[in-house]
């Protein structure tokens, strides 16, 4: 029978098929930066190249005895999970191992950097097919390790990293916190977050998705035919590295941005019990379990988007938060969220030639998040139109005035600090199609895009009664690009996108004193891409 | 994901009063020193000196050599363990933490990060 982890990530229609590149040869290469490995193990024999790379610190303790099977344990298991004959995700994939972890599973940032540089040098000396780098390790946040990952990713290498086993925010660890890395948390056979003793999988906005990481059967270094079970975010990352290898095997030209978007889009949604995570991390943590996506030929033309959360701004009066998309992605909308509701809104601005999503804290606020909606829109041409705040009592309107440009998102930023005097912004699909409308003291920003066959529409849902949140979803075939809250009550916490669902959050106290006439509205902008059609606004 | 995580960044910008050595002119360091927020994971004595992105190959070597020379002048022995050319410009150095102020004032230095442990997950 198929082990639970493989059954979980590989849909039934994929189980038997072999992933081959168009010319029939599987040319994807996976580099594993880990402990030494047992290359003669039956699971991986013949498909593993043990490089001469070795950059590890000395083992601690005077009574430490090097035992080959112990030294090779972690790396051998992961090599098996990636490309093992029986228990591997990408069974035919060739793998190169670099030793950056010693027999106690310890390495250094510097050793890892030298390992990444070794891969870059190999790539320069002998260019090959697609490269996947698996980093089943974690240390404290390291600016240079993250920067090295960024540089390597920009050469076309796909890096997959363990989120970490510290039951903590993955953003506090590297390489997990590197935006250019696909960061993987661990789930068990019940699709729940993995607990490891008193700790467990890391979580938070730096995690891209989860994958099986508990009781994973794989190659054991105890003997050449032995198997054993291991757990951790390393195992989860190895699954995703295997999935990526299979995706690249079929379609070697897929970019990092496309791979990440497809992994997110085709993952299993909403099966993880978010209560396991700390309350303040639940909204930031993706409820996604990886599965092998179908090829683009079977699902072509789909508009793919993901939500990117910024770091928390901090509580100072003028604190700002910034969320960025990957270089290949388009920032289609920007919203903000504050647990206290004290925020001064959000806007899109260009920094160093890249559009970024910004959010501003308000006086007395505990801080804000900026929430970017990052999408893959082929041949897109996007721009921001903004109008300064109107005088008291007047509405501010912004629409996409360029021909064939459609509205993909709205942002509102208030000049005034006093939350009591301002009416919050509104988006109206019926009276003013394709317009962002802001009220008193709000600067309004419209994100307008032109792309072949891009069409968009607004979808609203309002609730008058007490409710902590209002949601509106885009229907099948449509993708959520923008999400805003149009409040009837005095205080809203903000809005954000969860997959194809727009979530508008309301403050508890606001909920209590709301009159039935004041509806809080979640307003979603839903778009789709029909390559044959012209860009249009759908009413 | 993050630009700057929860880890220590220390500004070491104390101008050094050198005894008439022209190449050690006291230009104030704008570079920063960074280290792991978890003390037990730190590896004091080993540092990754990261240079500005546009730094040329020869300049990397010159900077490492300059650090060695200036350190030697003060009686410190340092070992350049590795020079990074291909992913980012910089070098790995084994030296006393006493020399961080000196190193941060070298031309082309963007920041210095203390080495730290990583662990199998």
């Amino acid at each position: 029978s198929i082990p639970w982890n493989l059954e979980r990530i590989i849909p039934a229609w994929h189980q038997t098929e072999e992933d081959r590149s168009p010319d029939g040869s599987s040319q994807v290469e996976v580099y594993l930066l880990d402990t030494s490995i047992q290359g003669a193990h039956r699971e991986i024999e013949g498909r593993v190249t043990i490089t001469d790379f070795n950059s590890v610190p000395e083992e601690d303790g005077t009574r430490f005895h090097r035992q080959a099977s112990k030294c090779d344990s972690h790396g051998t298991h992961l090599a098996g999970v990636v490309s093992g004959r029986d228990a591997g995700v990408a069974k035919g994939t060739s793998l190169h191992s670099l030793r950056v972890l010693n027999c106690q599973g310890k390495g250094t940032v510097s050793g890892t950097l030298i390992g990444l540089e070794f891969i870059r040098k190999s790539q320069l000396i002998q260019p090959s097919g697609p490269l996947v780098v698996l980093l089943p390790l974690a240390g404290g946040y390291s600016r240079i390790l993250n920067a090295a990952c960024r540089h390597l990713a920009r050469t076309g290498v796909v890096l997959v990293a363990a989120a970490g086993n510290f039951r903590d925010d993955a953003c506090l660890y590297s390489p997990a916190s590197a935006p250019e890395v696909i960061t993987v948390g661990a789930t068990n056979a019940q699709d729940q977050p993995v607990t490891l003793g008193t700790l467990g999988t890391n979580f938070g906005r730096c995690v891209d998705l989860f994958a099986p990481g508990k009781d994973i059967i794989g190659a054991s270094s105890d003997c050449s035919t032995c198997f054993m079970s291991q757990s951790g975010t390393s195992q989860a990352a190895a699954h995703v590295a295997g999935i990526v290898a299979r995706m690249l095997s079929r379609e070697p030209t897929l970019t990092l941005a496309e791979l990440r978007q497809r992994l997110i889009h085709f993952s299993t949604k909403d099966v993880i019990n978010m209560a396991w995570f700390p309350e303040d991390q639940q909204v930031l943590t993706p409820n996604l379990v990886a599965t092998l996506p179908p090829s683009t030929h079977e699902t072509g033309g789909q508009l793919l988007c993901r939500t990117v959360w910024s770091a928390h701004s901090g509580p100072t009066r003028t604190a700002t938060a910034t969320a960025r998309c990957a270089p290949e992605e388009e920032l289609l909308s920007c919203s903000s969220f504050s647990r206290s509701g004290r925020r001064r809104g959000d806007w899109i601005e260009a920094i160093g030639g890249q559009q970024v999503c910004k959010a501003l804290n308000a006086f007395g606020g505990e801080g804000v998040y900026a929430v970017a909606r990052c999408c893959l829109v082929p041949r897109a041409n996007c721009s921001i139109h903004n109008t300064p705040a109107a005088r008291a009592g007047l509405e501010t309107h912004v629409h996409c005035h360029q021909k064939d440009h459609v509205l993909t998102g709205c942002s509102f930023h208030w000049e005034v600090e006093d939350l009591s005097v301002r009416r919050q912004p509104a988006l109206r699909s019926r009276r003013q199609p394709g317009q962002c409308v802001g009220h008193q003291a709000a600067s309004v920003y419209a994100s307008c895009c032109h792309a072949p066959g891009l069409e968009c529409k607004i979808k609203e849902h309002g609730i008058s009664g007490p409710s902590e949140q209002v949601t509106v979803a885009c229907e099948a075939g449509w993708t959520l690009t923008g999400c805003n809250v149009l409040p009837g009550a005095s205080l809203t916490l903000g809005a954000y996108s969860v997959d194809n669902l727009c979530v508008a959050r309301v403050h508890d106290t606001a909920r209590a004193d709301r009159t039935s006439g004041e509806a809080t509205v979640a307003a979603a902008i839903c778009c789709r891409s029909r390559p044959s059609a012209k860009a249009s606004w759908v009413q | 994901q993050d630009e700057d995580g929860d880890y220590e960044e220390l500004m070491l910008a104390l101008p050094s009063q050198e005894d008439g050595l022209a190449d050690e002119a006291a230009h104030v360091a704008t570079a920063t020193f960074r280290r792991c927020s978890k003390e037990a994971w730190r590896l004091p004595g080993t540092y990754i000196v990261v240079l500005m992105e546009e730094t040329q190959r020869l300049q990397i070597e010159q900077t490492a050599h300059r650090l060695q020379t200036r350190a030697a002048r003060r009686g410190y022995v340092i070992k350049v363990l590795h020079i990074f050319y291909d992913l980012f410009p910089g070098f790995l150095v084994k030296m006393s933490s006493d020399l961080l102020g000196l190193a941060l004032k070298l031309p082309h230095v963007e920041y210095i990060e203390e080495d730290s442990f990583v662990f199998a997950q």
């Epitope: - | 050198e18 005894d19 060695q68 002048r73 003060r74 009686g75 410190y76 022995v77 006393s96």
Partner: antibody, heavy 114, light 108 residues
Framework: QVQLVESGGGLVQPGGSLRLSCAAS????????MHWVRQAPGKGLEWVSN????????YYADSVKGRFTISRDNSKNTLYLQMNSLRAEDTAVYYC???????WGQGTLVTVSS | DIVLTQSPATLSLSPGERATLSCRAS???????LAWYQQKPGQAPRLLIY???SRATGVPARFSGSGSGTDFTLTISSLEPEDFAVYYC?????????FGQGTKVEIK
């Protein structure tokens, strides 16, 4: 200009103690490693001990380990060598030297004799 | 420990002659940390050469240093009367810091 002046030498009985000082001026004392080097009468130079600029790192020659202690007071620009359990073979002129041994003091004579 | 052996122990030369002093290490020495000193009776040593080949401030050009690994040389191209003294080589790249036993350059 750079100046190093040793003091504290003298005659001491075997087993006795002595504390040498080296007053530094003309440079940023705390930036530099400082060393003690000795020279027995008619003999060559022998390195004794050194200390890093911050005082956090110290090294000793095997011949003095456990008996001598090097220290510094950066606020006073002074280097010290505490010598305990002195032996006849410790008799020498003791020099302090800066950094890469580019400046030396004039030396102070320590005589260990009964 | 790195043992430095200087040869010859004594060098008898006349002013104007070339002096070649040798220093051999028991193991490879990082040349950045190889120095030569001059010492005259009743005086403290004076740094002549650091980094195996760089002249210290105020040292006349007739003094030059060379070598790497385990073999190092101090050359005085043309001896002046004030050059007659004892010369020491030293390595300070490894602890313990060690000196050679010295070469005495005397007037012939």
């Amino acid at each position: 200009q750079v100046q190093l002046v040793e003091s504290g030498g003298g005659l001491v009985q075997p087993g006795g103690s002595l504390r040498l000082s080296c007053a530094a001026s003309g440079f940023t004392f705390s930036d530099y490693y400082m060393h003690w080097v000795r020279q027995a009468p008619g003999k060559g130079l022998e390195w004794v001990s050194n200390i890093s600029g911050s005082g956090s790192t110290t090294y000793y020659a095997d011949s003095v380990k456990g008996r001598f202690t090097i220290s510094r007071d950066n606020s006073k620009n002074t280097l010290y060598l505490q010598m305990n359990s002195l032996r006849a073979e410790d008799t020498a002129v003791y020099y302090c030297a800066r950094g890469m041994f580019d400046f030396w003091g004039q030396g102070t004579l320590v005589t260990v004799s009964s | 420990d790195i043992v430095l052996t200087q040869s010859p122990a004594t060098l008898s030369l006349s002013p104007g002659e070339r002096a070649t002093l040798s220093c051999r290490a028991s193991q490879s020495v990082n040349s950045n940390y190889l120095a030569w000193y001059q010492q005259k009776p009743g005086q403290a040593p004076r740094l002549l050469i650091y980094g195996a080949s760089s002249r210290a401030t105020g040292v006349p050009a007739r003094f030059s240093g060379s070598g790497s690994g385990t073999d190092f040389t101090l050359t005085i191209s043309s001896l002046e009367p004030e050059d007659f003294a004892v010369y020491y080589c030293q390595q300070w790249g490894d602890v313990p810091i060690t000196f050679g036993q010295g070469t005495k350059v005397e007037i012939k």
